[in-house]
C-alpha cells in the first residue's frame, strides 16, 4: 500500500494516540542503492524503533503528558553506515487522550467581597490544572459553582466564569449583599474537564469561603450650589470615600462640556473650582472614579449631581428693538392689537422671572394719550378708547416698561394704522386647467405658478396673501410658496407622487389675508382656484415583503410538504408568477401563483443548513419587471445516520502465537447533530459466535476496546463484527468489521516471505 | 574465527595488470563491505574503496577510479582488486579489510600483498 | 576530503609509562546520532594493521583496557597507560564519516 504507510524517505508527520499499546507500524521507508540501512535519531526517548528495513515503529504506549511532540531524524545508510540519503525530520504528533483528572491547586479558598461591588468584577480566582491538552476537550476546565449557602429566596449571589475560575457578584448579589444580614458565604466549586460536555469527563471540587465587607464607596446627596458665588474658590461642595486607602480618584465629564468646573482631590473630596451660572447651564452630573495604582477602576463610578440655583441676576429683554403690530381702521374697542412677549433668562416660573408690563409714553398723544393698553402679567396691547384713523395719525410709538422684582427694561412698539381689510384676495382664474406628470417626478419641483391679487393697502396684513390648498390633496403631496412681493405661489412637490394611490387629484386653492376682514366682508368663490393633476405610471418592479424569507423544518419532512412561502405584490397590480433561482439539489419548487415552497425531494441535513435559494417575483404581462429575494431553509438534525468507524482500520495485527490477550481501541462516529454532550455510542459484538474468543468494552461515548479471551488463535484474518448503537430516537445502529490478522512477526512486524508482500497488515498489537 | 587470507606478493612490468585475492572464512561472506587500502613506505596509507558482496556494489575513492577494479565472487568468498596499466608508484603493499556492519569499523584487516612494478 | 593530521611523527616512552597520541580532523566527525567516526589501530613492524578503537571511544573486542580514546569533534587522543614492549609501532588514526575514507600520516611508539 504505497503511500500510506511506505513510500520513500521524506519529511513526515504522524499522529499517535497517547496510551494506546502499540497496534500499528508507522511507517515503512523504502531505500535507494546504494542505502541498505536505517538509522532512527532524535527524540526516540528508547520508544521509537527502525529497523534495519526501514520499519518504523513504536514499542510502548506513548504519554503525551511526558512528551507531546518527538522530533525524529531518519538517515538512510549504505554498507558502511555512511548516510547517503537525509537525515529528514519525522514529527510524531503525540495525540492527547483524557487520562488526566483536573485538580484544585487548593482544597479550600478564601476571600472576601464588598458589598455593591460592580456584578461581573473578580476578586478571587480558583484554579485547576489539568495535564491534557488543553487545545482539545480534554484539557479545557469548566468551572462551576455547585451550591451557595446560604441560598437567600433562591437567588444566586455569586457566579463564576466557566473557563477562568473568576468568581464574582451578580447583579443580585451586587444589589442585594449585606453584611449586617449575613456577613459570610460558602461556595462548593466544581471542574470539569472535556469543557463539561460530557458526561465521561473527570472532575474535582474545592470549597470557598467568602466575607462580606461594607461598601462606603456611595453616591452622595444631590448638591444644590447657588450661582455667582463670590466666595473664595475652590469650595468644596461633597465627597466620596474608597473602602480602602491608596485609591486613585478622578471625575469623569460625561457630557463633554468646554469647561468643566470641579475637581477631586486625593482625599476623594470634590470642589466647584468657578462660580456657577445657572443661565449657562442649570444642572451638573457628572462621575466620580475610584482606580487602583495600575489606573484599573476599583469599582462602579459615583454619579454627582449638582443643581445650579438661581438669582435674579438677569433683567427682561426685548424681543427686538422695535416690534411691530398693524391695526385697522375702524377696528372696535378691546380688539387685540398683538402680544409683546419679553425674555428673561432666569428660571422659569420664578420670582426672578416673572414680568409685569406697563405703558410708559405713547406719541403722539392723539387724538388723546391713552389710546392703548397692556395687560400686566400678558403683554397683550388692545385698543382701549376708541377706533383710528389713519390720515389723522398713520402711526404710533409706544415705550413699555418691563420688570421683574429687581430690574426694569424698556421695550418699544411700533403701531401702524393700516386700511381696513375690505378687499377679499380675487384668482386672475378660477381653473388651472389639467396638468399630467410622471410619478417619479422630483421632490421640490415647481408643477404650477397661482396669481391672487388683492386691492388693500400694499404690503400690510390686510393684502397679503398666504394660499392654502384645501381639498384634493389629503396625504400632503404638494405646497404652495408665496413671494411677498408679488403675491405669486409657487405651487412645489413636497411628497413623491403615486400613481397608484392617486391617479387624478382634483386640487382647490384658498387665498387669504393674514389680517382678518372687516365685519360683514367674507371670502367667496374668487378666492378659490382648482386645477385638475393628472399622475401617470412609471413601471415599478414587483416588492418582496421581506429581504429574506426563513422556514424551518424537519429534515424527514415527507416529499410534498409546504417548507414556506414568499410574498411581492407589484405596485401597478399586475399579477405576479414566482420562480425559484439556485436550486442546486433539486430539493424544492415554488407555486407560481401563490409563493407556496414545496418539497420535491428527501432533504437531507447532513448535506448543508441552512439551504439558501433565491425567489424571484415577475410581472405578469406589462415589461415583465422582476425582483430576487432569498429563502433560507433551517434543516432540524433527524437520528438518520447510524454509527461508521471514524477511520480506515485496515491492517490490524497480533503477532502469533500470543503471548498474553491482546486488545486494540477503535472509535466510532456518526453525521447527524451532536449538541452539547457529543455522541452517546453503546457497543457491542456482532454475533453471538464471537463471544468465545472476543469481548467489546465501552471506553467513552466514542472509543471502545476490542480484547481477545484468549490466546488460541489461527495464524489467519478474522473478522470481528461489531455493532454500534447511537441510542437516538430513533436509535439507530451500524455493524462495522474489523478485520485483525494473527501472522507470524519479526522484530514486532508481520513477516511474509519475499514475494509475498501484498496485504501486509501494518497495525501490530 | 574471521581471517582475510590474500594472494602473494607480484613482480610486474610497468604497463601490465595484476589480480590480488582477499580470500574470506569465519563469517558469511556478504554480510559486510570488503574495503582495499594502499600503503606505500613514504606515502602512508591510502583508501582505495570497497564492494559489497551482496549486491555486487563499489565505490572508488576519485583518485583510484582508473586505476582500480573491484569485484567479489559470493561462490568462493573471494574479493578481487585489479590494478591495470602499472607504473613504479603503484609498488606498494595492499590491503584488504572488513568493515564489520553496524558497527562501522576495520575489525579484520588481510595480509597484504606487496606489489613491485619493475621491468 | 577530510584532512587528518598526526602532527607527531614519532613519540619515545619508557614502558610501564602513560603516553597520548594525538590526531586532528578538518571536519568534525561527530554525527547528529551522537557517534564520532574516528578510528584507531596499530601496524606493527612487518604486520597487518590491527583495530584499538572505534568510533572514538570505544575499545575493540580482545584490545587490552590500556587504550583508550578520548576528544572532541575534530581533536583527538589515544592513550595508553603502562606502555610495554609489544605496543611498539606505527598508531594511525582514520576518519570514516564520508568518502573518501583518510588516514593520518601515522605516529611512530618508540621505547626509551
Known amino acids: 500500500q504505497e503511500g500510506k504507510f511506505s513510500g520513500p524517505l521524506k519529511p513526515m508527520t504522524f499522529s499517535i494516540y497517547e496510551g494506546q499499546e502499540p497496534s500499528q507500524i508507522i511507517f515503512q521507508f523504502k531505500a535507494n542503492p546504494p542505502a541498505v540501512t536505517f538509522e532512527l535519531t532524535g527524540e526516540t526517548d528508547n520508544i521509537f524503533v527502525i529497523e534495519r528495513e526501514g520499519l518504523l515503529y513504536y514499542n510502548r504506549a506513548l504519554d503525551r503528558e511526558t512528551r507531546s511532540t518527538h522530533n525524529l531524524q531518519v538517515a538512510a545508510l549504505d554498507a558502511n553506515g555512511i548516510i547517503v540519503e537525509g537525515p529528514v525530520p519525522i514529527t510524531i504528533k503525540v495525540k492527547d487522550i483524557n487520562d488526566n483528572r483536573p485538580t484544585f491547586l487548593q482544597s479550600k479558598y478564601e476571600g472576601s467581597v464588598r458589598q455593591n461591588s460592580r456584578p461581573g468584577k473578580p476578586f478571587l480566582y480558583v484554579n485547576a490544572t489539568d495535564l491534557d491538552d488543553p487545545a482539545t476537550p480534554n484539557g479545557q476546565l469548566y468551572y462551576q459553582i455547585v451550591i451557595q449557602l446560604p441560598m437567600i429566596n433562591n437567588v444566586m449571589y455569586f457566579q463564576i466564569n466557566n473557563k477562568t475560575g473568576a468568581i464574582s457578584l451578580t447583579r443580585e448579589g451586587s444589589q442585594e449583599l449585606n453584611p449586617a444580614k449575613n456577613p459570610s458565604y460558602n461556595l462548593v466549586i466544581s471542574v470539569k474537564d472535556m469543557g463539561g460536555q460530557s458526561e465521561n469527563s473527570f472532575s474535582d471540587t474545592t470549597s470557598v469561603d467568602i466575607i462580606v465587607t461594607e461598601n462606603i464607596w456611595k453616591a452622595p446627596k444631590p448638591v444644590e450650589m447657588v450661582e455667582n458665588s463670590t466666595d473664595p474658590h475652590p469650595i468644596k461642595i461633597t465627597q466620596v470615600r474608597w473602602n480602602d486607602p491608596g485609591a486613585q480618584y478622578s471625575l469623569v465629564d460625561k457630557e463633554k462640556l468646554p469647561r468643566f468646573p470641579f475637581s477631586i482631590d486625593q482625599e476623594g473630596d470634590i470642589y466647584v473650582t468657578q462660580p456657577l451660572d445657572r443661565e449657562e447651564k442649570d444642572a451638573y452630573v457628572f462621575y466620580a472614579v475610584a482606580k487602583d495604582e495600575y489606573g484599573k477602576p476599583l469599582s462602579y463610578p459615583l454619579e454627582i449631581h449638582v443643581k445650579v440655583k438661581d438669582i435674579n441676576d438677569n433683567p427682561p429683554t426685548c424681543p427686538s428693538p422695535v416690534t411691530v403690530f398693524e391695526v385697522q381702521e375702524n377696528e372696535r374697542l378691546g380688539n387685540s392689537i398683538g402680544t409683546l412677549t419679553a425674555h428673561d433668562r432666569d428660571e422659569e416660573n420664578t420670582a426672578n422671572s416673572f414680568l409685569n408690563y406697563r405703558i410708559v409714553e405713547q406719541t403722539p398723544k392723539l387724538p388723546m394719550d391713552g389710546l392703548f393698553l397692556i395687560q400686566t402679567y400678558a403683554g397683550m396691547l388692545q385698543l382701549a378708547k376708541q377706533s383710528l384713523k389713519k390720515q389723522d395719525t398713520p402711526q404710533y410709538n409706544l415705550t413699555i416698561e418691563v420688570s421683574d422684582k429687581d430690574f426694569k427694561t424698556l421695550c418699544f412698539v411700533q403701531i401702524n394704522v393700516i386700511d381696513i381689510n375690505d378687499q377679499i384676495p380675487i384668482f386672475e382664474k378660477s381653473d388651472y386647467g389639467n396638468l399630467t406628470l410622471a410619478e417619479d417626478t422630483n421632490i421640490g419641483s415647481t408643477i404650477l405658478t397661482i396669481q391672487a391679487t388683492d386691492a388693500d393697502e400694499p404690503f400690510t396684513g390686510s393684502s397679503k396673501i398666504l394660499y392654502h390648498i384645501i381639498k384634493g390633496d389629503s396625504e400632503g403631496r404638494l405646497g404652495v410658496d408665496t413671494d411677498p412681493h408679488t403675491n405669486t405661489g409657487y405651487v412645489i412637490i413636497k411628497k413623491p407622487l403615486d400613481f397608484e394611490t392617486a391617479a387624478v387629484s382634483n386640487i382647490v386653492f384658498k387665498a387669504e389675508n393674514p389680517e382678518p376682514l372687516v365685519f360683514g366682508v367674507k371670502y367667496n368663490a374668487s378666492s378659490f382656484a382648482k386645477f385638475t393633476l393628472i399622475v401617470t405610471d412609471v413601471n415599478e418592479a414587483p416588492q418582496f415583503s421581506q429581504h429574506v424569507f426563513q422556514a424551518k423544518v424537519s429534515e424527514d419532512v415527507a416529499i410534498g410538504t409546504k417548507v414556506g412561502n414568499v410574498t411581492a405584490k407589484d405596485p401597478e397590480g399586475l399579477d405576479i408568477s414566482y420562480s425559484l433561482r439556485g436550486d442546486t439539489r433539486g430539493w424544492l419548487k415554488i407555486d407560481h401563483v401563490t409563493g407556496e415552497i414545496f418539497s420535491v425531494a428527501p432533504l437531507d441535513r447532513e448535506a448543508g443548513s441552512p439551504y439558501r435559494v433565491q425567489v424571484v417575483a415577475t410581472e405578469v404581462g406589462g415589461s415583465s419587471l422582476s425582483s430576487v429575494s432569498e429563502f433560507h431553509l433551517i434543516l432540524m438534525d433527524v437520528n438518520d445516520n447510524p454509527p461508521r468507524l471514524a477511520k480506515d482500520y485496515t491492517g490490524l495485527f497480533f503477532c502469533h502465537p500470543l503471548s498474553a490477550p491482546g486488545s486494540l481501541i477503535f472509535e466510532a462516529t456518526d453525521d447527524d447533530q451532536h449538541l452539547f454532550r457529543g455522541p452517546h455510542f453503546t457497543f457491542s459484538l456482532g454475533s453471538g459466535s464471537l463471544q468465545n474468543d472476543w469481548e467489546v468494552s465501552k471506553i467513552n461515548g466514542t472509543h471502545a476496546r476490542l480484547s481477545t479471551r484468549h490466546t488460541e488463535f489461527e495464524e489467519r484474518e478474522y473478522v470481528v463484527l461489531i455493532r454500534i448503537n447511537d441510542g437516538g430516537r430513533p436509535p439507530l445502529e451500524g455493524i462495522v468489521s474489523l478485520p485483525v490478522t494473527f501472522c507470524s512477526c519479526v522484530e514486532g512486524s508481520c513477516f511474509r516471505p519475499a514475494g509475498h508482500q501484498t496485504g501486509i497488515p501494518t497495525v501490530g498489537m | 574465527q574471521v581471517q582475510l587470507q590474500q594472494s602473494d606478493a607480484e613482480l610486474v612490468k610497468p604497463g601490465a595488470s595484476v589480480k590480488i585475492s582477499c580470500k574470506v572464512s569465519?563469517?558469511?561472506?556478504?554480510?559486510?563491505?570488503i574495503h582495499w587500502m594502499k600503503q606505500r613506505p613514504e606515502q602512508g596509507l591510502e583508501w582505495i574503496g570497497y564492494i559489497y558482496p551482496r549486491d555486487g556494489y563499489t565505490k572508488y575513492n576519485e583518485k583510484f577510479k582508473d586505476k582500480a577494479t573491484l569485484t567479489a565472487d559470493k561462490s568462493s568468498s573471494t574479493a578481487y582488486i585489479q590494478l591495470n596499466t602499472l607504473t613504479s608508484e603503484d609498488s606498494a603493499v595492499y590491503f584488504c579489510?572488513?568493515?564489520?556492519?553496524?558497527?562501522?569499523?576495520?575489525?579484520?584487516w588481510g595480509t597484504g600483498t606487496t606489489v613491485t612494478v619493475s621491468s | 576530503d577530510i584532512v587528518m593530521t598526526q602532527a607527531a611523527p614519532s613519540v619515545p616512552v619508557t614502558p610501564g609509562e602513560s603516553v597520548s597520541i594525538s590526531c586532528r580532523s578538518s571536519?568534525?566527525?561527530?554525527?547528529?546520532?551522537?557517534?564520532?567516526?574516528l578510528y584507531w589501530f596499530l601496524q606493527r613492524p612487518g604486520q597487518s594493521p590491527q583495530v584499538l578503537i572505534y568510533?572514538?571511544?570505544n575499545l575493540a573486542s580482545g584490545v587490552p583496557d590500556r587504550f583508550s580514546g578520548s576528544g572532541s569533534g575534530t581533536a583527538f587522543t589515544l592513550r595508553i597507560s603502562r606502555v610495554e614492549a609489544e605496543d611498539v609501532g606505527v598508531y594511525y588514526c582514520m576518519q570514516h564519516l564520508e568518502y573518501p575514507f583518510t588516514f593520518g600520516a601515522g605516529t611512530k611508539l618508540e621505547l626509551k
Open positions: 569465519g563469517y558469511t561472506f556478504t554480510d559486510h563491505t
Open positions: 568510533r572514538m571511544s
Open positions: 571536519k568534525s566527525l561527530l554525527r547528529s546520532n551522537g557517534n564520532t567516526y
Open positions: 579489510a572488513r568493515f564489520y556492519y553496524g558497527y562501522w569499523y576495520f575489525d579484520v
